[in-house]
């Protein structure tokens, strides 16, 4: 049955017959109302106040009508749709393409995809009529997305008489002479010839190589980027690109330093359903960087739970330095990672020994001054972790990074619900906690306990009558991460270290200050 | 290959003060260290800089006078020594560091003079 | 500040010969994270010193097999087996275990 639409020719976005919706007007603060009749949009001026409550992503402003409940967002440069969720500027997707919200609309047959709004796909599956439609990048665009985790984006296109999916053509990151790798490299074409011991790797057309499997006379030789040239590669599906050396006159194969593109403090973030003491029960895939962290007691048999852990590279964990007092050997540690349910395995988690850890050598066991500590994963090669949706790091911040006060932040933890009680969280849970300004984070605010220059303090600054739930970490939580959004990217601030009670209204939480120790860090985890 | 490119001799006045730049190419995450030799002398550590983070570690004797800074989107790192005196006329090398100090730059002459 | 002690200053050798660079540290240069950064590097006349041995023991690439290291704790060695006329130079150790990290004073090996 045909239908007669509205396209709006400033934002590309369709309507139906007697649909109206609202639009900012460029480079002015004014809003038009616009309805859809007989095709044509007609528009006016319409009065407008500020949102009652956030709505627009990346910075935008939201204004809702004044008279009735639509609301519009005025995107900042290189943001576009409704709640200002369209990246205009990304021009590749990273990884299987889920956090992808670029603005390709081409499938591989060249066909144009489909606005998610069509009526025409109201049955499919995915369509941007979900009530998660913002949350899985659809809406009133007809850009390729990946809302099912399928292996790249996609989008329906209307062939053979029907709307089927198909995928796109949208440029993956990792093509092209990237000097950089995602996931194992397999997709890497970049020009690094250096292994990790500093070795030359030699030509894929050596004659050396004569035998071996993959060399520029593979059949599929170009197809895996090899040829004559002596660039690292991965043409086996190994856990990162390599090439072909002689040592000490011997034929063999080394891991490459290639780098591998930074996809730190990217996440599947979805909104947490359930309320608990203290915060909001959350899945792991929203905090992909927590590490549960169990160690074998000399007392006890099997292993208890000891502390939160953050995953800041492939092979290196942060934690407190107050969770190794025990001074447990390594090999009594255990850290997973891609857990949802403390003690209940992950379909997807990642299960390491521990090969060594480092205590700051000045920790303070009184004042929890300099409370950090790095442990290295064991592995047999120089990965450990494999990034997923569940297993990713966090970014590091930047030596600078100097955030406004009362920024929003976010920590995670298996923690107790609160201070008295037994028992630690069976789940993982978040807490929203703001960052109190240095005037604010001083001895006399904490009952005198020293507070030190290496610390930061968060809280939940809601008004708490008797019964509000505030927001906080609590026993159990120590080691893991505070993390706030910096540039588009969850970025580590703080550790979660100590404080007095939990989610008591005014008592700030206390963390490690992560920026006084980004060179101590990086000096530790050289090779 | 990772190849740093430096910056040109200077000659400067004591009081004064100097910027050296090393221009790195290859796989840059690695941290830049700055190493100086007066002449006929040996070589003298004077800090580090990550390039990813911008974290910095300084030899005493340089903190307060030295400061090294990163620009990553032209893969260049820059060490300015301020306050200049005779004794700072030396060649100023960056070195890059992943498993040891690898990568040399050419070295750039500083010369204090009145 | 770890002190690093080279012996001798200055060492002439004939060609084909053996020749050993001793390096003294002021105290144990093992790093917090069980490595030991101790590192040989050459400086040719007129050129920027390069890389030949790091962690101890580990040849840089391309440097021949003719150069080792050994040592632990306070006191390591490199060893030429046997030098050649192009090995002519100063021989720094250095360490980078403990801020600030440090150069030996240099030993110049000159051919006899």
């Known amino acids: 049955s045909y239908q007669v639409i509205c396209r709006d020719e400033k934002t590309q976005m369709i309507y139906q017959q007697h649909q109206s919706w609202l639009r900012p007007v460029l480079r002015s603060n004014r809003v038009e109302y616009c309805w859809c009749n007989s095709g044509r949009a007609q528009c006016h001026s319409v009065p407008v106040k500020s949102c009652s409550e956030p709505r627009c992503f990346n910075g935008g402003t939201c204004q809702q009508a004044l008279y009735f409940s639509d609301f519009v967002c005025q995107c900042p440069e290189g943001f576009a749709g409704k709640c200002c969720e369209i990246d205009t500027r990304a021009t590749c997707y990273e990884d299987q393409g889920i956090s992808y919200r670029g603005t390709w609309s081409t499938a591989e047959s060249g066909a144009e995809c489909t606005n998610w709004n069509s009526s025409a796909l109201a049955q499919k599956p995915y369509s941007g009529r979900r009530p998660d439609a913002i949350r899985l990048g659809l809406g009133n665009h007809n850009y390729c997305r990946n809302p099912d985790r399928d292996s790249k984006p996609w989008c329906y296109v209307f062939k053979a008489g029907k709307y089927s999916s198909e995928f796109c053509s949208t440029p993956a990151c990792s093509e092209g002479n990237s000097d950089c790798y995602f996931g194992n490299g397999s997709a890497y074409r970049g020009t690094h010839s250096l292994t990790e011991s500093g070795a030359s790797c030699l030509p894929w057309n050596s004659m050396i190589l004569i035998g071996k499997v993959y060399t520029a006379q593979n059949p599929s030789a170009q197809a895996l980027g090899l040829g004559k040239h002596n660039y690292c590669r991965n043409p086996d599906g190994d856990a990162k690109p390599w090439c072909h050396v002689l040592k000490n006159r011997r034929l063999t194969w080394e891991y490459c330093d290639v780098p591998s593109c930074s996809t730190c403090g990217l996440r599947q973030y979805s909104q947490p359903q359930f309320r608990i003491k203290g915060g909001l029960f959350a899945d792991i895939a929203s905090h992909p960087w927590q590490a549960a962290i169990f160690a074998k007691h000399r007392r006890s048999p099997g292993e208890r739970f000891l502390c939160g852990g953050i995953l800041i590279s492939s092979c290196w964990i942060l934690s407190a330095a107050h969770c190794f007092q025990e001074r447990f050997p390594p090999h009594h540690l255990t850290v997973i990672l891609g857990r949802t349910y403390r003690v209940v395995p992950g379909e997807e988690e990642q299960k390491f020994e521990v090969e060594k850890y480092i205590v700051h050598k000045e920790f303070d066991d009184d004042t929890y001054d300099n409370d950090i500590a790095l442990l290295q994963l064991k592995s047999d090669s120089s990965r450990c972790a494999q990034e997923s949706s569940v297993v990713r790091t966090v970014c590091l911040p930047p030596a600078d990074l100097q955030l406004p006060d009362w920024t929003e932040c976010e920590l995670s933890g298996y923690g107790k619900h609160e201070a008295l009680s037994p028992f630690y969280s069976e789940r993982l849970k978040e807490a929203h906690v703001r960052l109190y300004p240095s005037s604010r984070c001083t001895s006399q605010h904490l009952l005198n306990r020293t507070v030190t220059d290496n610390m930061l303090c968060a809280g939940d600054t809601r008004s708490g009558g008797p019964q509000a739930n505030l927001h906080d970490a609590c026993q159990g939580d120590s080691g893991g991460p505070l993390v706030c959004l910096n540039d588009g990217r969850m970025t580590l601030v703080g550790i979660i270290s100590w404080g007095l009670g939990c989610g008591q209204k005014d008592v700030p939480g206390v963390y490690t200050k992560v920026t006084n120790y980004l060179d101590w860090i990086r000096d530790n985890m050289r090779p | 290959q990772v190849q740093l490119v430096q910056s040109g001799a200077e000659v400067k006045k004591p009081g004064a003060s100097v910027k050296v730049s090393c221009k790195a190419s290859?796989?840059?995450?690695?941290?830049i260290n700055w190493v100086r030799q007066a002449t006929g002398q040996g070589l003298e550590w004077m800090g580090r800089i990550d390039p990813g983070g911008g974290s910095t570690g300084y030899a005493q004797k340089f903190q307060g006078r030295v400061t090294m800074t990163v620009n990553t989107s032209i893969s260049t790192a820059y060490m300015e020594l301020s306050s200049l005196r005779s004794e700072d006329t030396a060649v100023y090398y960056c070195a890059s560091y992943y498993y040891a100090m690898a990568y040399w730059g050419q070295g750039t002459l500083v010369t204090v003079s009145s | 500040d770890v002190v690093m002690t080279q012996s001798p200053l200055s060492l002439p050798v004939t060609p084909g010969e053996p020749a050993s660079i001793s390096c003294r540290s002021s105290q144990s240069i093992v790093h917090s994270n069980g490595n030991t950064y101790l590192d040989w590097y050459l400086q040719k006349p007129g050129q920027s010193p390069q890389l030949l041995i790091y962690k101890v023991s580990n040849r840089a690439s391309g440097v021949p097999d003719r150069f080792s290291g050994s040592g632990s704790g306070t006191d390591f060695t490199l060893k030429i087996s046997r030098v050649e006329a192009e090995d002519v130079g100063v021989y720094y150790c250095?360490?980078?275990?403990?801020?600030?990290?440090?150069f030996g004073g240099g030993t110049k090996v000159e051919i006899k």
């Open positions: 250095f360490q980078g275990s403990h801020v600030p990290w440090t």
């Open positions: 290859g796989n840059t995450s690695y941290w």
